[in-house]
Protein backbone atom coordinates (compact mmCIF):
# COMPACT_ATOMS: atom_id res chain seq x y z
CA UNK A 1 0.00 0.00 0.00
CA UNK A 2 2.64 2.50 -1.13
CA UNK A 3 1.73 6.18 -1.33
CA UNK A 4 -0.78 7.25 -3.97
CA UNK A 5 -1.66 10.78 -5.10
CA UNK A 6 -5.28 10.87 -4.04
CA UNK A 7 -7.35 13.62 -5.63
CA UNK A 8 -10.23 12.72 -3.33
CA UNK A 9 -13.90 12.71 -4.29
CA UNK A 10 -14.48 14.94 -7.32
CA UNK A 11 -17.97 16.20 -6.49
CA UNK A 12 -17.71 18.76 -9.30
CA UNK A 13 -18.35 15.86 -11.63
CA UNK A 14 -21.64 14.64 -10.21
CA UNK A 15 -22.49 12.15 -12.97
CA UNK A 16 -26.14 11.26 -13.44
CA UNK A 17 -27.26 8.52 -15.81
CA UNK A 18 -30.64 6.95 -16.51
CA UNK A 19 -31.50 3.48 -15.33
CA UNK A 20 -31.55 0.76 -17.99
CA UNK A 21 -29.59 2.84 -20.49
CA UNK A 22 -25.99 2.58 -21.68
CA UNK A 23 -23.51 4.87 -19.95
CA UNK A 24 -19.89 5.58 -20.82
CA UNK A 25 -17.88 7.33 -18.14
CA UNK A 26 -14.38 8.60 -18.78
CA UNK A 27 -11.85 8.50 -15.97
CA UNK A 28 -11.59 12.16 -14.83
CA UNK A 29 -7.86 11.83 -14.15
CA UNK A 30 -6.95 12.48 -17.78
CA UNK A 31 -9.50 15.24 -18.27
CA UNK A 32 -8.93 17.34 -15.18
CA UNK A 33 -6.02 16.23 -13.04
CA UNK A 34 -3.11 14.91 -15.09
CA UNK A 35 -1.17 16.63 -17.85
CA UNK A 36 -1.01 13.54 -20.05
CA UNK A 37 -3.66 11.42 -21.75
CA UNK A 38 -4.50 7.73 -21.46
CA UNK A 39 -2.50 6.70 -24.53
CA UNK A 40 0.67 8.28 -23.14
CA UNK A 41 0.09 6.65 -19.76
CA UNK A 42 -0.57 3.26 -21.34
CA UNK A 43 2.56 3.54 -23.50
CA UNK A 44 4.56 4.31 -20.35
CA UNK A 45 3.42 1.05 -18.78
CA UNK A 46 0.81 2.53 -16.44
CA UNK A 47 -2.33 0.49 -15.73
CA UNK A 48 -5.81 1.91 -15.12
CA UNK A 49 -7.70 0.15 -12.35
CA UNK A 50 -11.36 0.71 -11.47
CA UNK A 51 -13.17 0.06 -8.21
CA UNK A 52 -16.20 1.40 -6.44
CA UNK A 53 -18.00 1.98 -3.14
CA UNK A 54 -21.70 1.16 -3.12
CA UNK A 55 -24.18 3.75 -1.96
CA UNK A 56 -24.35 3.94 1.87
CA UNK A 57 -21.29 1.67 2.25
CA UNK A 58 -17.71 2.41 3.23
CA UNK A 59 -16.08 -0.64 1.69
CA UNK A 60 -14.19 -0.18 -1.57
CA UNK A 61 -14.57 -3.20 -3.82
CA UNK A 62 -13.42 -4.14 -7.29
CA UNK A 63 -15.87 -3.77 -10.16
CA UNK A 64 -17.14 -7.07 -11.48
CA UNK A 65 -16.22 -7.14 -15.17
CA UNK A 66 -17.47 -10.75 -15.52
CA UNK A 67 -21.20 -10.04 -15.51
CA UNK A 68 -23.49 -11.66 -18.12
CA UNK A 69 -23.37 -9.96 -21.52
CA UNK A 70 -20.42 -7.87 -20.31
CA UNK A 71 -22.86 -5.50 -18.64
CA UNK A 72 -19.94 -3.56 -17.16
CA UNK A 73 -16.72 -3.31 -19.12
CA UNK A 74 -13.69 -1.08 -19.48
CA UNK A 75 -12.30 0.20 -22.75
CA UNK A 76 -9.18 2.36 -22.55
CA UNK A 77 -10.06 5.13 -20.06
CA UNK A 78 -13.84 4.57 -20.30
CA UNK A 79 -16.03 2.56 -17.95
CA UNK A 80 -19.05 1.15 -19.82
CA UNK A 81 -22.45 0.09 -18.53
CA UNK A 82 -24.61 -1.77 -21.05
CA UNK A 83 -27.02 -0.93 -19.49
CA UNK A 84 -27.04 0.62 -16.00
CA UNK A 85 -29.00 -0.73 -13.04
CA UNK A 86 -30.35 1.33 -10.16
CA UNK A 87 -27.97 -0.27 -7.68
CA UNK A 88 -24.93 0.82 -9.73
CA UNK A 89 -25.21 4.12 -7.83
CA UNK A 90 -22.10 4.82 -5.76
CA UNK A 91 -18.65 6.40 -5.75
CA UNK A 92 -16.35 5.13 -8.49
CA UNK A 93 -12.56 5.37 -8.38
CA UNK A 94 -10.10 5.15 -11.22
CA UNK A 95 -6.49 4.60 -10.28
CA UNK A 96 -3.51 4.89 -12.60
CA UNK A 97 -0.43 3.07 -11.37
CA UNK A 98 2.72 1.09 -11.90
CA UNK A 99 5.44 0.09 -9.42
CA UNK A 100 6.71 3.65 -8.96
CA UNK A 101 3.71 5.87 -9.67
CA UNK A 102 0.13 6.05 -8.44
CA UNK A 103 -2.66 8.60 -8.88
CA UNK A 104 -6.37 8.18 -8.26
CA UNK A 105 -9.63 10.09 -8.15
CA UNK A 106 -13.14 9.16 -7.07
CA UNK A 107 -16.40 10.54 -8.45
CA UNK A 108 -20.07 10.01 -7.63
CA UNK A 109 -22.31 8.19 -10.10
CA UNK A 110 -26.05 8.37 -9.62
CA UNK A 111 -28.39 6.11 -11.57
CA UNK A 112 -31.77 7.83 -11.75
CA UNK A 113 -35.22 6.70 -12.77
CA UNK A 114 -37.45 8.57 -15.19
CA UNK A 115 -41.19 8.40 -15.74
CA UNK A 116 -42.99 7.98 -19.06
CA UNK A 117 -42.82 11.75 -19.60
CA UNK A 118 -39.06 11.86 -18.96
CA UNK A 119 -39.46 13.55 -15.57
CA UNK A 120 -36.61 12.66 -13.22
CA UNK A 121 -34.25 14.12 -10.60
CA UNK A 122 -31.70 14.62 -13.40
CA UNK A 123 -30.17 18.12 -13.45
CA UNK A 124 -31.01 19.53 -16.87
CA UNK A 125 -28.72 21.68 -19.00
CA UNK A 126 -30.33 24.96 -20.11
CA UNK A 127 -30.12 26.08 -23.72
CA UNK A 128 -31.01 29.72 -24.40
CA UNK A 129 -32.69 30.68 -27.67
CA UNK A 130 -33.10 34.25 -28.83
CA UNK A 131 -36.68 35.34 -29.35
CA UNK A 132 -37.71 35.87 -33.00
CA UNK A 133 -34.37 34.70 -34.40
CA UNK A 134 -34.72 33.04 -37.79
CA UNK A 135 -33.39 29.53 -37.26
CA UNK A 136 -31.81 28.19 -34.08
CA UNK A 137 -30.88 24.61 -33.34
CA UNK A 138 -30.37 22.47 -30.32
CA UNK A 139 -28.40 19.25 -30.61
CA UNK A 140 -29.05 16.01 -28.76
CA UNK A 141 -26.24 16.19 -26.19
CA UNK A 142 -23.73 13.62 -24.90
CA UNK A 143 -24.31 10.85 -27.42
CA UNK A 144 -20.83 10.81 -28.97
CA UNK A 145 -18.92 7.56 -28.63
CA UNK A 146 -21.91 5.32 -27.98
CA UNK A 147 -22.06 3.84 -31.47
CA UNK A 148 -19.81 3.90 -34.54
CA UNK A 149 -20.53 6.27 -37.43
CA UNK A 150 -21.58 3.29 -39.54
CA UNK A 151 -24.60 2.80 -37.25
CA UNK A 152 -27.57 4.98 -38.14
CA UNK A 153 -29.67 5.47 -35.02
CA UNK A 154 -33.30 6.57 -34.94
CA UNK A 155 -33.91 9.82 -33.06
CA UNK A 156 -37.28 10.86 -31.68
CA UNK A 157 -37.79 14.30 -30.17
CA UNK A 158 -40.37 15.20 -27.52
CA UNK A 159 -41.52 18.44 -25.96
CA UNK A 160 -42.55 17.51 -22.44
CA UNK A 161 -44.60 14.38 -22.94
CA UNK A 162 -45.48 14.94 -26.58
CA UNK A 163 -43.72 13.63 -29.64
CA UNK A 164 -42.72 16.52 -31.89
CA UNK A 165 -44.47 16.07 -35.18
CA UNK A 166 -46.33 18.72 -37.15
CA UNK A 167 -45.27 21.42 -34.70
CA UNK A 168 -45.48 24.64 -36.67
CA UNK A 169 -42.11 26.14 -35.77
CA UNK A 170 -40.19 23.23 -34.19
CA UNK A 171 -38.72 20.80 -36.68
CA UNK A 172 -36.84 17.57 -35.84
CA UNK A 173 -33.83 17.06 -38.12
CA UNK A 174 -32.07 13.95 -36.85
CA UNK A 175 -29.79 14.83 -33.95
CA UNK A 176 -30.84 18.49 -34.28
CA UNK A 177 -34.07 20.22 -33.39
CA UNK A 178 -34.67 23.46 -35.28
CA UNK A 179 -36.69 26.38 -33.96
CA UNK A 180 -38.05 28.86 -36.49
CA UNK A 181 -38.86 32.34 -35.15
CA UNK A 182 -38.86 31.18 -31.54
CA UNK A 183 -41.52 32.48 -29.17
CA UNK A 184 -41.81 32.30 -25.39
CA UNK A 185 -44.25 29.39 -25.83
CA UNK A 186 -41.24 27.37 -27.03
CA UNK A 187 -39.94 27.39 -23.44
CA UNK A 188 -39.90 23.91 -21.96
CA UNK A 189 -38.11 20.60 -21.64
CA UNK A 190 -37.08 18.88 -24.86
CA UNK A 191 -36.04 15.25 -24.94
CA UNK A 192 -34.29 13.26 -27.64
CA UNK A 193 -34.45 9.49 -27.50
CA UNK A 194 -31.68 7.87 -29.54
CA UNK A 195 -32.23 4.21 -30.38
CA UNK A 196 -29.40 2.10 -31.78
CA UNK A 197 -28.55 -1.58 -32.21
CA UNK A 198 -25.47 -3.25 -30.77
CA UNK A 199 -24.62 -6.97 -30.86
CA UNK A 200 -28.21 -8.01 -31.45
CA UNK A 201 -29.54 -5.80 -28.67
CA UNK A 202 -31.36 -2.46 -28.87
CA UNK A 203 -30.30 0.38 -26.61
CA UNK A 204 -31.93 3.73 -25.87
CA UNK A 205 -30.25 6.96 -24.85
CA UNK A 206 -32.50 9.62 -23.31
CA UNK A 207 -31.27 13.20 -23.14
CA UNK A 208 -33.39 16.08 -21.84
CA UNK A 209 -32.57 19.76 -21.88
CA UNK A 210 -34.45 22.91 -20.94
CA UNK A 211 -35.03 25.54 -23.60
CA UNK A 212 -35.37 29.13 -22.39
CA UNK A 213 -36.29 31.81 -24.89
CA UNK A 214 -34.53 35.08 -24.05
CA UNK A 215 -34.32 38.62 -25.38
CA UNK A 216 -32.59 39.03 -28.68
CA UNK A 217 -29.36 41.02 -29.01
CA UNK A 218 -30.85 42.87 -31.97
CA UNK A 219 -33.35 44.44 -29.56
CA UNK A 220 -30.81 45.09 -26.80
CA UNK A 221 -30.31 48.67 -25.62
CA UNK A 222 -27.98 50.33 -23.12
CA UNK A 223 -29.29 50.42 -19.54
CA UNK A 224 -32.35 52.64 -19.08
CA UNK A 225 -32.66 54.54 -15.79
CA UNK A 226 -36.35 54.97 -14.97
CA UNK A 227 -35.68 56.53 -11.60
CA UNK A 228 -34.34 58.98 -10.56
CA UNK A 229 -35.75 61.25 -13.24
CA UNK A 230 -36.48 64.92 -13.87
CA UNK A 231 -40.10 64.66 -12.77
CA UNK A 232 -39.51 63.70 -9.16
CA UNK A 233 -37.94 66.02 -6.59
CA UNK A 234 -36.91 64.57 -3.23
CA UNK A 235 -37.78 67.42 -0.91
CA UNK A 236 -36.98 66.75 2.76
CA UNK A 237 -36.60 68.56 6.05
CA UNK A 238 -33.54 67.84 8.20
CA UNK A 239 -34.23 64.87 10.46
CA UNK A 240 -36.52 63.12 7.97
CA UNK A 241 -35.65 59.90 6.17
CA UNK A 242 -34.39 60.29 2.63
CA UNK A 243 -35.26 57.38 0.32
CA UNK A 244 -34.21 57.52 -3.34
CA UNK A 245 -34.83 54.54 -5.61
CA UNK A 246 -32.59 53.91 -8.57
CA UNK A 247 -34.52 51.69 -10.97
CA UNK A 248 -32.72 50.46 -14.07
CA UNK A 249 -33.88 48.30 -16.97
CA UNK A 250 -31.30 46.03 -18.62
CA UNK A 251 -31.93 44.23 -21.91
CA UNK A 252 -31.00 40.56 -21.77
CA UNK A 253 -27.46 40.09 -23.02
CA UNK A 254 -25.76 36.72 -22.91
CA UNK A 255 -22.95 36.73 -20.33
CA UNK A 256 -23.32 40.45 -19.60
CA UNK A 257 -22.65 41.68 -16.07
CA UNK A 258 -25.29 44.23 -15.09
CA UNK A 259 -24.21 46.74 -12.45
CA UNK A 260 -26.00 49.52 -10.57
CA UNK A 261 -24.35 51.80 -8.04
CA UNK A 262 -24.81 55.14 -6.32
CA UNK A 263 -22.27 57.91 -5.88
CA UNK A 264 -22.61 60.69 -3.34
CA UNK A 265 -20.59 63.77 -4.24
CA UNK A 266 -18.72 61.57 -6.71
CA UNK A 267 -17.75 58.93 -4.15
CA UNK A 268 -19.05 55.42 -3.48
CA UNK A 269 -21.24 55.33 -0.32
CA UNK A 270 -18.65 53.10 1.39
CA UNK A 271 -16.06 55.86 1.02
CA UNK A 272 -17.97 58.57 2.85
CA UNK A 273 -18.79 59.06 6.50
CA UNK A 274 -22.57 59.57 6.38
CA UNK A 275 -24.84 56.73 7.49
CA UNK A 276 -26.20 55.40 4.20
CA UNK A 277 -27.82 52.04 3.53
CA UNK A 278 -28.49 50.61 0.11
CA UNK A 279 -30.95 47.78 -0.54
CA UNK A 280 -31.13 46.04 -3.90
CA UNK A 281 -33.90 44.02 -5.51
CA UNK A 282 -33.87 42.33 -8.91
CA UNK A 283 -36.74 41.18 -11.10
CA UNK A 284 -36.76 39.50 -14.51
CA UNK A 285 -39.16 39.59 -17.45
CA UNK A 286 -40.17 36.44 -19.30
CA UNK A 287 -37.32 36.99 -21.74
CA UNK A 288 -34.83 37.53 -18.91
CA UNK A 289 -34.58 41.28 -19.31
CA UNK A 290 -33.66 42.55 -15.87
CA UNK A 291 -34.90 45.40 -13.69
CA UNK A 292 -32.63 46.30 -10.77
CA UNK A 293 -33.69 48.67 -8.03
CA UNK A 294 -31.25 50.06 -5.50
CA UNK A 295 -32.83 52.17 -2.78
CA UNK A 296 -30.51 54.65 -1.16
CA UNK A 297 -31.61 55.45 2.39
CA UNK A 298 -30.42 58.02 4.92
CA UNK A 299 -32.39 57.57 8.15
CA UNK A 300 -32.00 61.13 9.50
CA UNK A 301 -30.94 63.46 6.76
CA UNK A 302 -29.03 66.65 7.62
CA UNK A 303 -29.14 69.97 5.81
CA UNK A 304 -25.60 69.15 4.61
CA UNK A 305 -26.82 65.85 3.15
CA UNK A 306 -29.55 67.70 1.27
CA UNK A 307 -26.91 69.75 -0.55
CA UNK A 308 -25.02 66.69 -1.80
CA UNK A 309 -25.10 65.27 -5.31
CA UNK A 310 -26.75 61.81 -5.51
CA UNK A 311 -26.10 60.05 -8.81
CA UNK A 312 -27.32 56.65 -9.91
CA UNK A 313 -25.01 54.79 -12.32
CA UNK A 314 -25.67 51.70 -14.43
CA UNK A 315 -23.49 49.61 -16.70
CA UNK A 316 -23.94 46.61 -18.98
CA UNK A 317 -22.13 45.24 -22.01
CA UNK A 318 -24.20 47.75 -24.04
CA UNK A 319 -22.91 50.84 -22.25
CA UNK A 320 -22.87 53.00 -19.15
CA UNK A 321 -25.40 55.65 -18.05
CA UNK A 322 -25.90 57.91 -15.05
CA UNK A 323 -28.69 60.09 -13.66
CA UNK A 324 -28.67 62.56 -10.77
CA UNK A 325 -31.55 62.70 -8.31
CA UNK A 326 -33.13 66.07 -7.61
CA UNK A 327 -32.73 66.55 -3.87
CA UNK A 328 -33.55 69.76 -2.03
CA UNK A 329 -34.33 71.03 1.44
CA UNK A 330 -37.98 71.67 2.11
CA UNK A 331 -38.71 75.28 2.99
CA UNK A 332 -40.66 75.15 6.29
CA UNK A 333 -44.22 76.47 6.12
CA UNK A 334 -44.56 79.81 7.95
CA UNK A 335 -45.82 79.54 11.55
CA UNK A 336 -48.97 81.74 11.66
CA UNK A 337 -48.63 83.05 15.21
CA UNK A 338 -45.29 84.72 14.62
CA UNK A 339 -44.52 85.23 10.93
CA UNK A 340 -48.02 85.84 9.58
CA UNK A 341 -49.12 87.97 12.50
CA UNK A 342 -46.07 90.18 12.07
CA UNK A 343 -46.94 90.46 8.41
CA UNK A 344 -50.36 91.82 9.31
CA UNK A 345 -48.83 94.57 11.48
CA UNK A 346 -49.60 92.98 14.85
CA UNK A 347 -47.22 93.80 17.67
Amino acid sequence: SERCDDWGLDTMRQIQVFEDEPARIKCPLFEHFLKFNYSTAHSAGLTLIWYWTRQDRDLEEPINFRLPENRISKEKDVLWFRPTLLNDTGNYTCMLRNTTYCSKVAFPLEVVQKDSCFNSPMKLPVHKLYIEYGIQRITCPNVDGYFPSSVKPTITWYMGCYKIQNFNNVIPEGMNLSFLIALISNNGNYTCVVTYPENGRTFHLTRTLTVKVVGSPKNAVPPVIHSPNDHVVYEKEPGEELLIPCTVYFSFLMDSRNEVWWTIDGKKPDDITIDVTINESISHSRTEDETRTQILSIKKVTSEDLKRSYVCHARSAKGEVAKAAKVKQKVPAPRYTVELACGFGAT
Epitope: E132, G134, N169, L183, K218
Partner: antibody
Framework: EVQLLESGGGLVQPGGSLRLSCAAS????????MGWVRQAPGKGLEWVSA????????LYADSVKGRFTISRDNSKNTLYLQMNSLRAEDTAVYYC???????????WGQGTLVTVSS | EIVMTQSPATLSVSPGERATLSCRAS??????LAWYQQKPGQAPRLLIY???TRATGIPARFSGSGSGTEFTLTISSLQSEDFAVYYC?????????FGQGTKVEIK
Protein backbone atom coordinates in the same frame (compact mmCIF):
# COMPACT_ATOMS: atom_id res chain seq x y z
CA GLU B 1 -43.97 57.47 -40.12
CA VAL B 2 -44.23 53.70 -40.66
CA GLN B 3 -45.55 52.85 -44.12
CA LEU B 4 -46.17 49.51 -45.81
CA LEU B 5 -47.26 49.48 -49.44
CA GLU B 6 -48.34 46.25 -51.12
CA SER B 7 -48.37 45.67 -54.89
CA GLY B 8 -48.57 42.84 -57.38
CA GLY B 9 -52.16 41.74 -56.89
CA GLY B 10 -54.50 41.07 -59.78
CA LEU B 11 -56.58 38.48 -61.62
CA VAL B 12 -54.98 35.08 -62.18
CA GLN B 13 -56.27 31.73 -63.40
CA PRO B 14 -56.36 28.67 -61.10
CA GLY B 15 -52.96 26.99 -61.13
CA GLY B 16 -51.28 30.27 -61.98
CA SER B 17 -48.66 32.28 -60.10
CA LEU B 18 -48.36 35.76 -58.70
CA ARG B 19 -45.69 37.62 -56.77
CA LEU B 20 -46.70 40.19 -54.20
CA SER B 21 -44.35 42.89 -52.94
CA CYS B 22 -44.49 45.09 -49.88
CA ALA B 23 -42.31 48.21 -49.76
CA ALA B 24 -41.51 49.34 -46.23
CA SER B 25 -40.41 52.76 -44.99
CA UNK B 26 -40.28 54.80 -41.81
CA UNK B 27 -38.60 52.16 -39.65
CA UNK B 28 -35.50 49.94 -39.60
CA UNK B 29 -36.89 47.14 -41.76
CA UNK B 30 -34.02 44.73 -41.06
CA UNK B 31 -34.86 44.56 -37.34
CA UNK B 32 -38.49 43.48 -37.66
CA UNK B 33 -40.20 40.23 -38.45
CA MET B 34 -42.74 40.58 -41.23
CA GLY B 35 -45.83 38.66 -42.20
CA TRP B 36 -48.68 38.30 -44.65
CA VAL B 37 -52.32 38.15 -43.57
CA ARG B 38 -55.21 37.68 -45.97
CA GLN B 39 -58.93 38.37 -45.93
CA ALA B 40 -61.32 36.62 -48.30
CA PRO B 41 -64.23 38.82 -49.47
CA GLY B 42 -66.70 39.29 -46.60
CA LYS B 43 -64.68 37.00 -44.32
CA GLY B 44 -62.29 37.32 -41.38
CA LEU B 45 -58.51 37.60 -41.16
CA GLU B 46 -56.23 34.62 -41.77
CA TRP B 47 -52.50 34.55 -41.05
CA VAL B 48 -50.64 33.28 -44.14
CA SER B 49 -46.90 33.47 -43.53
CA ALA B 50 -44.15 35.03 -41.45
CA UNK B 51 -40.45 35.65 -41.91
CA UNK B 52 -37.79 36.52 -39.36
CA UNK B 53 -35.95 39.84 -39.47
CA UNK B 54 -32.90 38.16 -41.05
CA UNK B 55 -34.91 36.16 -43.60
CA UNK B 56 -33.66 32.80 -42.32
CA UNK B 57 -36.79 31.61 -40.53
CA UNK B 58 -40.00 31.21 -42.50
CA LEU B 59 -43.39 29.87 -41.39
CA TYR B 60 -46.58 29.11 -43.29
CA ALA B 61 -50.20 28.35 -42.62
CA ASP B 62 -51.08 24.75 -43.53
CA SER B 63 -53.43 26.05 -46.23
CA VAL B 64 -50.53 27.53 -48.25
CA LYS B 65 -47.58 25.32 -47.25
CA GLY B 66 -45.66 24.08 -50.28
CA ARG B 67 -47.32 26.60 -52.61
CA PHE B 68 -46.36 30.00 -51.20
CA THR B 69 -42.87 31.29 -50.45
CA ILE B 70 -42.15 34.32 -48.29
CA SER B 71 -38.87 36.18 -48.69
CA ARG B 72 -37.36 39.58 -48.04
CA ASP B 73 -34.62 41.84 -49.34
CA ASN B 74 -33.38 43.96 -46.46
CA SER B 75 -31.21 46.06 -48.77
CA LYS B 76 -34.38 47.11 -50.64
CA ASN B 77 -36.68 47.23 -47.58
CA THR B 78 -39.04 44.92 -49.40
CA LEU B 79 -41.06 41.85 -48.43
CA TYR B 80 -42.27 39.33 -51.01
CA LEU B 81 -44.83 36.56 -51.30
CA GLN B 82 -44.42 34.19 -54.24
CA MET B 83 -47.74 32.41 -54.77
CA ASN B 84 -47.80 29.32 -56.99
CA SER B 85 -50.52 26.76 -57.83
CA LEU B 86 -53.17 29.32 -56.95
CA ARG B 87 -56.68 28.15 -56.11
CA ALA B 88 -60.04 29.89 -56.04
CA GLU B 89 -59.95 29.82 -52.23
CA ASP B 90 -56.79 31.96 -52.30
CA THR B 91 -58.90 34.88 -53.52
CA ALA B 92 -58.49 37.59 -50.89
CA VAL B 93 -57.02 40.94 -50.01
CA TYR B 94 -53.42 40.30 -48.93
CA TYR B 95 -51.97 42.56 -46.26
CA CYS B 96 -48.36 42.78 -45.25
CA UNK B 97 -47.69 43.62 -41.61
CA UNK B 98 -44.69 43.99 -39.35
CA UNK B 99 -44.49 42.20 -36.03
CA UNK B 100 -42.63 41.97 -32.77
CA UNK B 101 -43.20 39.19 -30.28
CA UNK B 102 -44.72 41.53 -27.71
CA UNK B 103 -46.90 43.72 -29.94
CA UNK B 104 -48.10 41.28 -32.62
CA UNK B 105 -48.89 42.98 -35.97
CA UNK B 106 -48.51 46.65 -35.07
CA UNK B 107 -48.54 48.18 -38.57
CA TRP B 108 -50.36 47.01 -41.69
CA GLY B 109 -50.31 47.92 -45.35
CA GLN B 110 -53.48 48.92 -47.18
CA GLY B 111 -53.71 45.53 -48.92
CA THR B 112 -53.66 44.22 -52.47
CA LEU B 113 -56.47 42.17 -54.01
CA VAL B 114 -55.69 38.76 -55.50
CA THR B 115 -58.49 37.19 -57.53
CA VAL B 116 -58.15 33.57 -58.69
CA SER B 117 -60.77 32.80 -61.28
CA SER B 118 -61.11 31.23 -64.70
CA GLU C 1 -53.60 25.18 -33.71
CA ILE C 2 -55.25 27.48 -31.20
CA VAL C 3 -58.84 28.34 -32.08
CA MET C 4 -60.04 31.83 -31.15
CA THR C 5 -63.79 32.29 -30.65
CA GLN C 6 -65.36 35.74 -30.43
CA SER C 7 -68.78 36.63 -29.10
CA PRO C 8 -71.20 38.02 -29.96
CA ALA C 9 -70.95 37.93 -33.74
CA THR C 10 -72.80 41.25 -33.87
CA LEU C 11 -73.26 43.83 -31.14
CA SER C 12 -75.85 46.61 -31.52
CA VAL C 13 -75.02 49.59 -29.34
CA SER C 14 -76.14 53.22 -29.18
CA PRO C 15 -73.50 55.96 -29.34
CA GLY C 16 -72.29 56.88 -25.87
CA GLU C 17 -73.03 53.41 -24.52
CA ARG C 18 -70.53 50.84 -23.32
CA ALA C 19 -69.59 47.88 -25.52
CA THR C 20 -68.09 44.64 -24.21
CA LEU C 21 -66.59 42.14 -26.65
CA SER C 22 -65.39 38.67 -25.65
CA CYS C 23 -62.71 36.41 -27.02
CA ARG C 24 -61.94 32.87 -25.90
CA ALA C 25 -58.88 30.78 -26.75
CA SER C 26 -59.03 26.98 -27.04
CA UNK C 27 -55.91 26.79 -24.84
CA UNK C 28 -53.95 29.26 -22.75
CA UNK C 29 -52.22 32.03 -24.69
CA UNK C 30 -50.91 33.73 -21.54
CA UNK C 31 -51.31 37.46 -22.16
CA UNK C 32 -50.19 37.24 -25.80
CA LEU C 33 -53.42 38.55 -27.24
CA ALA C 34 -54.09 41.51 -29.53
CA TRP C 35 -57.26 43.33 -30.57
CA TYR C 36 -57.67 44.98 -33.97
CA GLN C 37 -60.26 47.33 -35.39
CA GLN C 38 -61.20 47.18 -39.06
CA LYS C 39 -63.46 49.57 -40.93
CA PRO C 40 -64.90 48.78 -44.37
CA GLY C 41 -62.29 49.07 -47.12
CA GLN C 42 -59.48 49.67 -44.66
CA ALA C 43 -56.64 47.62 -43.19
CA PRO C 44 -56.91 46.40 -39.62
CA ARG C 45 -55.50 48.70 -36.94
CA LEU C 46 -53.84 47.48 -33.74
CA LEU C 47 -55.76 48.64 -30.66
CA ILE C 48 -54.49 46.49 -27.80
CA TYR C 49 -51.52 44.17 -27.36
CA UNK C 50 -50.38 42.10 -24.40
CA UNK C 51 -54.11 41.69 -23.59
CA UNK C 52 -54.32 45.09 -21.90
CA THR C 53 -51.77 47.58 -23.31
CA ARG C 54 -53.12 50.26 -25.63
CA ALA C 55 -51.18 50.73 -28.85
CA THR C 56 -49.76 54.15 -29.72
CA GLY C 57 -52.46 56.74 -30.42
CA ILE C 58 -55.39 54.62 -29.25
CA PRO C 59 -57.92 56.56 -27.12
CA ALA C 60 -58.36 55.68 -23.44
CA ARG C 61 -61.96 54.58 -24.00
CA PHE C 62 -60.55 51.30 -25.38
CA SER C 63 -59.40 48.87 -22.71
CA GLY C 64 -58.47 45.20 -22.73
CA SER C 65 -58.42 42.65 -19.95
CA GLY C 66 -57.98 38.94 -19.33
CA SER C 67 -55.28 36.32 -19.53
CA GLY C 68 -55.02 32.62 -20.26
CA THR C 69 -58.14 31.75 -22.26
CA GLU C 70 -60.69 34.51 -21.53
CA PHE C 71 -60.29 38.05 -22.83
CA THR C 72 -62.44 41.16 -23.06
CA LEU C 73 -62.29 44.36 -25.08
CA THR C 74 -64.31 47.21 -23.58
CA ILE C 75 -65.22 50.46 -25.31
CA SER C 76 -66.41 52.67 -22.47
CA SER C 77 -68.42 55.19 -24.48
CA LEU C 78 -68.93 54.44 -28.15
CA GLN C 79 -68.18 57.22 -30.61
CA SER C 80 -69.46 57.25 -34.17
CA GLU C 81 -65.99 56.32 -35.47
CA ASP C 82 -65.90 53.17 -33.32
CA PHE C 83 -68.54 51.29 -35.33
CA ALA C 84 -66.45 48.65 -37.07
CA VAL C 85 -65.43 44.99 -36.94
CA TYR C 86 -63.13 43.94 -34.09
CA TYR C 87 -60.80 40.94 -34.22
CA CYS C 88 -58.83 39.26 -31.47
CA UNK C 89 -55.62 37.42 -32.29
CA UNK C 90 -53.31 35.19 -30.28
CA UNK C 91 -49.58 35.44 -30.85
CA UNK C 92 -48.49 32.98 -28.20
CA UNK C 93 -48.03 30.00 -30.55
CA UNK C 94 -47.45 29.59 -34.24
CA UNK C 95 -49.61 29.63 -36.25
CA UNK C 96 -50.91 32.98 -35.05
CA UNK C 97 -54.70 32.80 -35.24
CA PHE C 98 -57.57 35.30 -35.36
CA GLY C 99 -61.07 35.19 -34.04
CA GLN C 100 -63.89 35.38 -36.57
CA GLY C 101 -64.67 38.99 -35.62
CA THR C 102 -67.38 40.93 -33.81
CA LYS C 103 -69.28 43.58 -35.74
CA VAL C 104 -70.22 46.59 -33.62
CA GLU C 105 -73.14 48.36 -35.28
CA ILE C 106 -75.32 51.35 -34.45
CA LYS C 107 -78.48 50.45 -32.59
Amino acid sequence: EVQLLESGGGLVQPGGSLRLSCAASGFIFSTYGMGWVRQAPGKGLEWVSAISYDGEGTLYADSVKGRFTISRDNSKNTLYLQMNSLRAEDTAVYYCARFRYYTAFDYWGQGTLVTVSS
Amino acid sequence: EIVMTQSPATLSVSPGERATLSCRASQSVSSNLAWYQQKPGQAPRLLIYGASTRATGIPARFSGSGSGTEFTLTISSLQSEDFAVYYCQQYNNWPWTFGQGTKVEIK
